[in-house]
Each structure stands twice: as C-alpha cells, then as structure tokens.
Interface confidence: low
C-alpha cells in the first residue's frame, strides 16, 4: 500500500524498508544449508488447533538444540542457463531454502507492476532497477509470511521447500521475447518460470508431491497465467504425479470503468486494459492456451483478468483478494490519498467491492476481506486477518484437505473447514481484523469509524440511506458488523 497502514502489533518495531533489499549474512558457523525438521503432513485430519499446539511444543523443545543452526534465509541461485534473463540481459534467478524432509514446494512470484513502452521501461530502469536487473540482488533473502519456516509465522506450510522468484521481467510474468535489434529490453517472465522449474527438478523438486505456485500483485496475475503451463511442463518431463496448484494474491483485477479517465501516459494512470493491450505486443506476452482460444486475435489481454481466465484453468487455484485493493483503486484513479473524498468516490469504491464480490461468486476457494490494502501472503502478520472467523492459513489448510479428499465423490465443503470466504459488509475496513490504519500525521491507530470520518464519510447521510440511527451505524462500523 501507500504507507498508511502497518502490519505490526502494538509495540513492535516498524518493518525494514522494502527497497532496496539489504544484504544479510548467513548465520555464522553454518557450513551447509540447514535442514528443517523432517515432518510432512500434507493433509492433517482432526483439530488443527490441537495439531498446531503439538507442532509448536515440538518446535520449542527442539529449538535449544538447534539454536546455533537456525537460518531463516533463502539463498540466491542465478540461472545456469544464462540466456534466460531479466530485462537488461542479466541472468534471472531464484532464492531457495530447502527442507529436505518435505515433499511440498512453494514457488513464489514477486510482484511490482509492469512497464509497456520504451519510455516507461527507461523510467523504471532508472528508478526501480532491481525490478529489471539482477545486478544488485542480495545473496540472501529472509522468508516472511507464507515463505517463513517458523510455525508461529506460517502455520500453513512452514516446513515446505521455499522458493522466491524475483520479478525482473516487467511483463506480469507473461513474456517470451528474446533480445532483438528493435528491443532495448527483453521480456522473459514466462520463460523464467519454466527455467526455474527445470533447474529445481535437479534440486529435489522431482520428488515433490505438491507444487504450489503462489504470487502477489503482478505475481498473483502471473500465477493465473502460468499455473497450467507449469503443470503441463512437469507432465511432459515425466512428473505427472506432482500436483500443481495456484495461490493468486492481489492479482485478480477488474476491467471496470475508471473513476476518472486518464490518457495512457504512465504505468499507473493508464487504464490496465490499455496498458496490457500495449504490453502484450511489446513483451510478446503469452496467455493460457484454453483462454486464448476464447478470444479473437488482439483480444488476448482479456486473459490477464482473473474472472475471465479462471474458468479456463485446469489446476486448482485459491484466490486471495482485498475487496478494496489499492492497486485496483490506483489504476481506476480512485485511490484514497488522505484527503476527504467526494460522495461519488465513496459510491465508486463501494461499487468496486460489490463488483469484485460478484466475480468471486463461482470461485470455490477464495479469501476476500473488506479491507483497503494490497498484497498479504508474504507479510509477517498474514495470519491476523479473518473472514467470518477464519484466518487465511486456516482456509488454505481447509483447501488442502478438500483437495486431498476430492477423490471422494462428495462436493460439499468440509464441516467446520470453509474455503469460500468473502466478506459481505460494504465499506473499506468494515471487517475489524483488517490491517491497522494509522493517522499518517500522528501515527495514532484509528478505528473504522474514525478512519471513515477522516476520509470524509458522511455518517448522517449514509445512516439515512440505510434507515439507521447515526449512532447505531457508528456502533456497527466500530464492531465491524
């Protein structure tokens, strides 16, 4: 997001700057990669809370023995095939933390918008070079959120083999172009994924039971564009038993009408459909075959939209999307800047939540809180947000179980284990577990009612519209009902 929200509990230190990445040294005294404790429960029956308590107790009892050996870092591996590159021709790569006892592999695609012309790619290269080049990548990265190996931070898949694939192709992971006289930059997003998978087969992926391709923002869209292709690749290479699944976070965008129409000048104010239309040509972008066949030539941009590509996918995909996604609002020129908003903008924002909710109606595995935010799965406090009393790691666990049980004919959801979790309340932050909002001047936390009034929300008018007493409405907002 834009700095208004924080993801820390009271009293915690602010997270370090996301840019530029800082080099972190490997823990002293570790001569080789540290193995995780080799337990692997691909589907856990029974009470998850009790299971987690046992895991936590086990982890804590083992902790003193291995304190010297703990190493949370994922280590950089540049691709051996140096013809598969970032925009500037430097080799692409991935960060890996192996977990020898596990047959689960999590491959995470980083996000970071895109560029779609020589001009805005030049500008991106000047100001965000790490998103176009591997030249300054640090040797290690710390796994956070779903990439963490700590059961407390990652109750879902803490023991998996973790792979972070940095985004350096600026093409929403769709490009399949090579260096040419005409192009200053190359766009190889789809080829990078293919090559990473190829190289990981030699590092243990060949023995995997489940490969979860996850991603946030442009990486989330990248999941939708590439998940079937990864499954196909593994099948063709002789690994049909590896179950390929997708987890798309904050990459489910709408081609709705912009709040204020703007000319297509830069990456953000350009309507996403127009940017992608131009981008596909510039990147030589690839979309899933089954989706492409549904649209005529020149209309492939439709396949970048979750609600259009999702029905054509073969692999199971879990969709995570804030109902009031900041990237969507920015693209729609309706983002909240801290200034009071006009009534028209409020209605527009509410309507966005309504439209997004509609597109998720037929997505059985989804988690969509009514919050104003962007990205969640690699944030340290990704466990904090709940929809209808269920957290995201819990929903993912239920999804795993439903897939594990799917050979059984029954299509009914598992009792007490929901996987379709979409908020129904209509305002940004009407869910009380949304990430904390802080007043950007005082740093004070704000509750929902304070936030909405701060943004110019007219309690009287809205209460009238809803046929409620203003005090009743404020009470409802504060409690998140």
């Amino acid at each position: 997001g834009e700095g208004r929200k924080t993801w820390r509990r009271r009293g915690q230190q602010p997270a370090p700057a996301p840019l530029p990445p800082q080099r972190t040294e490997a823990a002293p005294g570790t001569g080789q990669p540290v193995e995780s404790f080799p337990l692997d429960f691909t589907a856990v029956e029974g009470n998850m809370d009790s299971f987690m308590a046992q895991v936590k107790s086990l982890a804590q009892s083992l902790y003193p023995c291995s304190a010297q050996q703990l190493n949370e870092d994922l280590r950089l591996h540049l691709l051996l095939n140096t013809s598969v590159t970032c925009n500037d021709g430097s080799p692409a790569g991935y960060y890996l933390k192996e977990s020898k006892g596990s047959r689960r592999w999590l491959l995470f695609l980083e996000g970071g918008w895109y560029c779609f012309s020589r001009e805005n790619c030049d500008s991106r290269y000047d100001t965000m070079r790490r998103l176009m080049s591997s030249k300054d990548w640090p040797q290690t990265r710390t796994g956070t959120g779903i990439l963490s190996s700590q059961p407390e931070e990652n109750p879902y898949w803490w023991n998996a083999n973790m792979v972070f694939i940095p985004y350096c192709s600026s093409d929403v992971w769709s490009g399949a172009s090579s260096k040419s006289e005409k192009n200053e930059y190359v766009f190889m997003g789809a080829l990078i994924i293919r090559e990473v998978v190829q190289e990981l087969l030699g590092r243990g992926l060949s023995g995997a039971k489940v490969l979860l391709l996850a991603g946030s923002s442009a990486g989330g869209t990248g999941v939708l564009l590439n998940v079937d292709r990864v499954a196909e690749q593994l099948e063709q290479l002789g690994y049909p038993a590896i179950q390929v699944r997708g987890l798309a976070d904050s990459g489910w965008f709408l081609d709705n009408k912009q709040y204020r129409r703007t000319d297509c000048v830069d990456t953000v104010t350009c309507a996403p459909t127009e940017a992608i239309r131009r981008g596909i040509r510039y990147w030589n972008g690839m979309v899933p075959e089954r989706c492409r066949s549904q649209f005529k030539e020149g209309e492939e941009w439709n396949c970048f939209l979750g609600y259009k590509v999702y029905p054509t996918l073969r692999c199971p995909v879990f969709v995570v999307q804030w109902l009031f996604d900041e990237a969507q609002l920015t693209a729609d020129n309706a983002h909240l800047t801290g200034q009071p908003v006009q009534e028209g903008q409020w209605l527009y924002i509410q309507n966005l939540g309504h439209e997004l909710r509609n597109t998720l109606k037929d997505v059985p595995a989804s988690f969509a809180p009514a919050c104003l935010s962007h990205e969640i799965i690699i944030r340290s406090h990704w466990t904090d947000v709940q929809v209808k009393g269920t957290s995201l790691p819990r929903a993912l666990h239920c999804w795993d179980r439903s897939l594990h049980d799917s050979h059984k004919a029954s299509k009914t959801p598992l009792k007490g284990c929901p996987i379709h979790l979409v908020d129904s309340c209509p305002w940004p932050h009407c869910n009380p577990s949304c990430p904390t909002i802080r007043d950007q001047f005082t740093g004070q936390e704000m509750n929902v009612a304070q936030f909405l009034m701060h943004m110019g929300f007219d309690v009287q008018t809205v209460a009238q519209q809803q046929g409620l007493e203003p005090s009743k409405l404020l009470g409802m907002l504060s409690s998140g009902s």
Epitope: E2, L19, G112, D126, T127, R129, R130, S217, A327, H374
Partner: antibody
C-alpha cells in the same frame, strides 16, 4: 569513499558562458543517473538538469532549457554543465548529485561550486 | 510540475521534545506501492544530506530519532527527541516524475 567534487565556478558577466565539471570517485559512475541542482543565496534548492546513466535521457528545468547543456563522460567519470546566456538570477551554488536508482532520491551530493553572474 | 508546500516555514522546539514538519504535494507522488518523497537536512555552508527516502525509510547512518511517514499527497518528518545539532534547515523533495521539486524549507530552532 564515494565522492563528487565540482569545479569551474566563477564570476561572469550577464550574457556570458561557463562550464562546470563534477568528478566522481568511489562508485561505478556509469551505473547512475546524475543531476545538477542549485541554491541561490539564502534561498531554497532548485533542480537544474538530469542525464541518465547512458546519456539516453536528458532533461532540463524550463527556465534553463536552451541555455544549459548537461553531458557526461563515463570513461573519465565526469559530469559537465555548459551554461550560456547567463543571467543574474543564475547566481547560485551549483551542486552535482547522484540519483539513487531505486527511488530517484539524491543519495550523494558534491560540496558545490559558486557561480556569480554580475556586471 | 508538482508543487511541494512545506510547513511551517520555521519551528521552535524545546530540547528533547518532538519536531514535526509537514510537506504537501499538489498531486499524488505515490505509485506502485511506493511513495517518492524524500527528506534532507542542510546545515549552513554544507550540501544537503539525505535523511529519509521513499517516505519512511531511514538512510544508513542517520539516527533513529528521525522518522518519516505519509502517502499520496501528505507527508511528515518527525524528529524526537530533538537535539542541539538538529537546529538547521530541512527540505522535502519528490522524485515521482521529472522535474523533481523541493519544498521551500523549514528552519528548526532549539530553545
């Protein structure tokens, strides 16, 4: 040590010309976009001109367009600013600064060189 | 061009207290999840020195007493607790698009 050192500042008459130089050391000069900025006596900071790492993008403040020319020699690690048709309002301390390429802020500044335009 | 309005123009703060300087942009300087607003300190006879980059990130070597916040159009530099050596001028600057522009500066005095 990362360092930028400007030179070439002088007293010059209105309408005259002057060339400022900036010598870089301690970092890979050819990797960075570079800027010239200035500060008139007792005034705030004003951006003058920008040149990208490979000299493909040049940009100037409106009041300096056509009068000032920014250039660089990556082999010699030098940045230059050729100023012509100088006016009294161009009197200032001129700084060269390195642009950080993960955000566009100025993370390294020179100590400045003084240009005085007066008859 | 994006105009940055810095306030107050001058500020008197007691030793050990909090100094808060604001900077408002005429247009949003946030894009793709990053806010392109930076803060500098300039002492007399010296070039400016970077304190905070991308709205809230502390430049290495700068004391943790300095912090930045904000997004979109409204940004704040906080200094707490203020020390004697902090008495000087502070500028905000954006790099969202060319041309980059600066605020007019805030002169901090310690009493």
């Amino acid at each position: 040590e990362v360092q930028l050192v400007e030179s070439g500042g002088d007293l010059v008459k209105p309408g005259g010309s002057l060339k400022l130089s900036c010598a870089a050391s301690g970092f890979t000069f050819s990797d960075y976009g570079m800027h010239w900025l200035r500060q008139a006596p007792e005034k705030g900071l004003e951006w003058v001109a920008y040149i990208s790492s490979g000299s493909t993008t040049l940009s100037y403040a409106n009041t300096m367009k056509g009068r000032f020319t920014i250039s660089r020699d990556n082999a010699k690690k030098t940045l230059s600013l050729q100023m012509t048709s100088l006016r009294s309002e161009d009197t200032a301390i001129y700084y060269c600064a390195r642009k950080n390429y993960n955000g566009g802020y100025f993370d390294v500044w020179g100590t400045g060189t003084t240009v005085t335009v007066s008859s | 061009d994006i105009v940055l309005t810095q306030s107050p123009a001058s500020l008197v703060v007691s030793l050990g207290q909090r100094a808060t300087i604001s900077c408002r942009a005429s247009k949003s300087v946030s894009e793709s999840g990053y806010s392109y607003m930076h803060w500098y300190q300039q002492k007399p006879g010296q070039p400016p020195k970077l304190l905070i980059y991308l709205a809230s990130n502390l430049e290495s070597g700068v004391p943790a007493r300095f912090s930045g916040s904000g997004s979109g159009t409204d940004f704040t530099l906080n200094i707490h607790p203020v020390e004697e050596g902090d008495a000087t001028t502070y500028y905000c600057q954006h790099s969202r698009v060319l041309p980059p522009t600066f605020g007019s500066g805030t002169k901090l005095e310690i009493k």
